[in-house]
Interface confidence: low
């Protein structure tokens, strides 16, 4: 049909930097390049009806989804959404074409769904409708990646099932200790599947996608190192496979490794071994055990032996269910005001944890170091001397783990005064919680040193906010000193602050500070 | 299938009243929907429309006669036409989610 208008859909994605939510404006924002959302022909329908290709958004991103008619004359429309019906005001590019544009600031759920735009030009009415979903995240998983031997080939295969397909690396390293940590110059990306260099210091395999990064260490015992003081300790859940590497080298190729379980041989198929000269002339072994799917009765110890080494041992537990062990009881903290502390968390866990810290509703990355002991630690040092309630959170697939912290600075109390026509009160959040006195001042006490005992009202409280506590004391007014200025103090082993109130009749009341150290 | 069925119109003097129905089948919710108009040679317009806070939108026109209300157990969005004029006559339609109804022909008469 000739008489029907050109008319082009397109998103806009933008990067974020508004909170607002759905306007229907040409709204300025940073944008990426328009994607063109196609806007077909609707067939077999009653009306002339323009289907866009339906738009997957990120929650909280931005977005505008805009239609440019080719049309003569001037346009009006209506853009309607659930409830919502909203006037829209078209405006014309520098090719004449009616631009319609609707804003969506920071997707929700409740942005969501079917966006009908009503369009009436000179010569026709006609519908625009736009599916607007949130992209399905739900359904993403990120599994941390496992192992397995490559058919008929000495190479390693990393599998990790998660959705989106993760792109999957290697990351290698030949030195030993901090010198492999992640940015080091030490350390080899390789962006594929299979490794066959299996020879090296330290090999992990890494996963990533939408979701994030996940890395599995293939579990390493070198005879060449000294043993660590307590024995390594490997965990895995039933039917997860287990794969240690024995390494070795020696002068000559004149040695040969075995792996036992708990003193006996294993049997063939759960084992493999490669060997290589090094630059130097000396042979390389390594002995790989492995087990496609353990059962309980692979737990026990693992121990790789040589003709020419001392032979070593790793501990191999098979749980049913992952876990979390660390003390949970809180823990309370008092430093000075300058001192450097760290909250820390000592934790054995399997799978590897993700966690938190979190202080005033406000949440901070959480790094995690693996100890020789097989224990893991988190330290949290940014609390930038806030006094209040600190809280570690961790979770794996199977076990959720909290602890509270309490911290608490030990300062001058800083006094604060407020007054009403029957009392007034002072506040202070000094640690350690200061005691109060109120005085009277007065001709025959113009020091103010009369000292008011009757009337007076102490109480602490949670500032729930920050989890601080706050010391309060109210004075309740009598006709004695109506009038009068009072002074409460507050000290503490560090110090003393006052605030001197003049109790006037009902009004606004002045307030000195007074501090004294 | 979408399906959107318009009944109520008629024949009406000049002054009187209609009450028009829109049933929707095969359609989730009628909260999308909109009653628009067209007149012998003209353009179809917007008649009314449900707001952002629940409330609801008319032409200007039509202010304080005419309004809108859904029956969502029944699936159906109804037009009550108060004060009925002359240039009022024209064929109403519902449409919601890119379908448009066949439409039902008021005629108001002086």
């Known amino acids: 049909n000739q008489d029907l208008p050109v008319i082009k859909c397109v998103l806009i994605n933008h990067k974020n930097n508004d909170s607002s939510v759905g306007k229907s404006s040409s709204y300025p924002m940073v944008s990426e390049s328009p994607e063109d959302l196609g806007c077909a022909l609707r067939p077999q329908s009653s009306g002339t009806v323009y289907e866009a290709a339906a738009v997957e958004v990120d929650v909280s991103a931005s977005i505008t989804l805009q239609v440019l008619v080719d049309a003569p004359g001037n346009i009006s429309c209506l853009w309607v959404f659930k409830h919502s019906s909203l006037n829209c005001q078209p405006h014309f590019d520098l090719q004449n074409r009616g631009v319609v544009s609707m804003v969506i600031l920071k997707m929700t759920e409740t942005q969501a769904g079917e966006y009908l735009l009503f369009i009436q030009s000179e010569a026709t009415n006609y519908t625009i409708l736009f599916t607007v979903s949130i992209r399905n995240t739900l359904l993403y998983t990120l599994r941390r990646p496992y192992f397995r031997k490559m058919e008929n080939q000495d190479a390693l295969v990393c599998i990790s099932e998660s959705v989106p397909e993760p792109i999957v690396e290697w990351v290698l390293c030949d030195s030993q200790g901090e010198s492999c940590k992640e940015e080091s110059p030490a350390v080899v990306k390789k962006e594929e599947k299979v490794l066959h260099e299996l020879f090296g210091t330290d090999i992990r395999c890494c996963a990533r996608n939408e979701l994030g990064r996940e890395c599995t260490r293939l579990f390493t015992i070198d005879l060449n190192q000294t043993p660590q003081t307590t024995l390594p300790q490997l965990f895995l859940k039933v039917g997860e496979p287990l794969w240690i590497r024995c390494k070795a080298v020696h002068v000559n190729h004149g040695f040969g490794l075995t792996w036992e379980l708990e003193n006996k041989a294993l049997e063939e198929g759960n084992y493999f071994e490669m060997s290589t000269y090094s630059t130097n002339r000396t042979m390389i072994r390594i002995l790989f055990a492995f087990v496609s799917s353990v059962a309980r009765n692979d737990t026990g110890y693992y121990t790789c032996s040589s003709s020419k080494h001392p032979s070593q041992s790793a501990l191999v537990t098979i749980v049913e269910k992952g876990f979390i062990n660390a003390t949970n009881s809180s823990e309370d903290y008092e430093i000075d005001q300058y001192e450097e502390f760290c909250f820390s968390v000592r934790f054995k866990a399997y799978p590897q944890i993700r966690c938190t810290w979190t202080f005033s509703r406000k949440s901070f990355p959480c790094e995690q170091k693996g100890l020789d002991n097989g224990y893991s630690i988190s330290k949290f040092c940014n609390h930038k001397h806030q006094p209040g309630e600190y809280i570690f959170h961790a979770e794996n697939d199977d076990a959720q783990f909290t602890k509270m912290f309490t911290l608490n600075i030990r300062r001058k109390p800083q006094v604060l005064a407020e007054a009403s026509a029957s009392q007034a009160s002072c506040f202070s959040d000094g640690y350690p919680l200061p005691s109060w006195t109120w005085k009277k001042c007065s001709d025959k006490s113009p020091n103010c040193t009369e000292e008011i005992t009757e009337g007076v009202w102490n109480r602490k409280a949670n500032r729930k906010v920050f989890g601080q506590w706050v010391s309060s004391s109210t004075l309740n007014m009598s006709e004695a000193i109506k009038g009068f200025l009072v002074k409460c103090c507050a000290y503490n082993s560090l110090g003393t602050s006052c605030e001197t109130i003049l109790l006037n009749s009902p009004g606004p009341f002045p307030f000195i500070q007074d501090n004294i150290s | 299938q979408v399906q959107l069925q318009e009944s109520g119109g008629g024949l009406v003097q000049a002054g009187g009243s209609l009450r028009l129905s829109c049933a929707a089948s095969g359609i989730f919710s009628t909260n999308y929907m909109v009653w628009c108009r067209q007149a012998p040679g003209k353009q179809r317009e917007l008649v009314a429309a449900?707001?952002?806070?629940?409330?609801?939108l008319y032409a200007d026109s039509l202010k304080g006669r005419f309004s809108i209300s859904q029956d969502n157990a029944k699936n159906t969005v109804l037009l009550l036409m108060n004060s009925l004029k002359p240039e009022d006559t024209a064929v109403y339609y519902c449409c919601g989610l890119g379908h448009w109804g066949r439409g039902t022909k008021v005629t108001v008469s002086s």
């Open positions: 449900f707001t952002n806070d629940g409330g609801t």
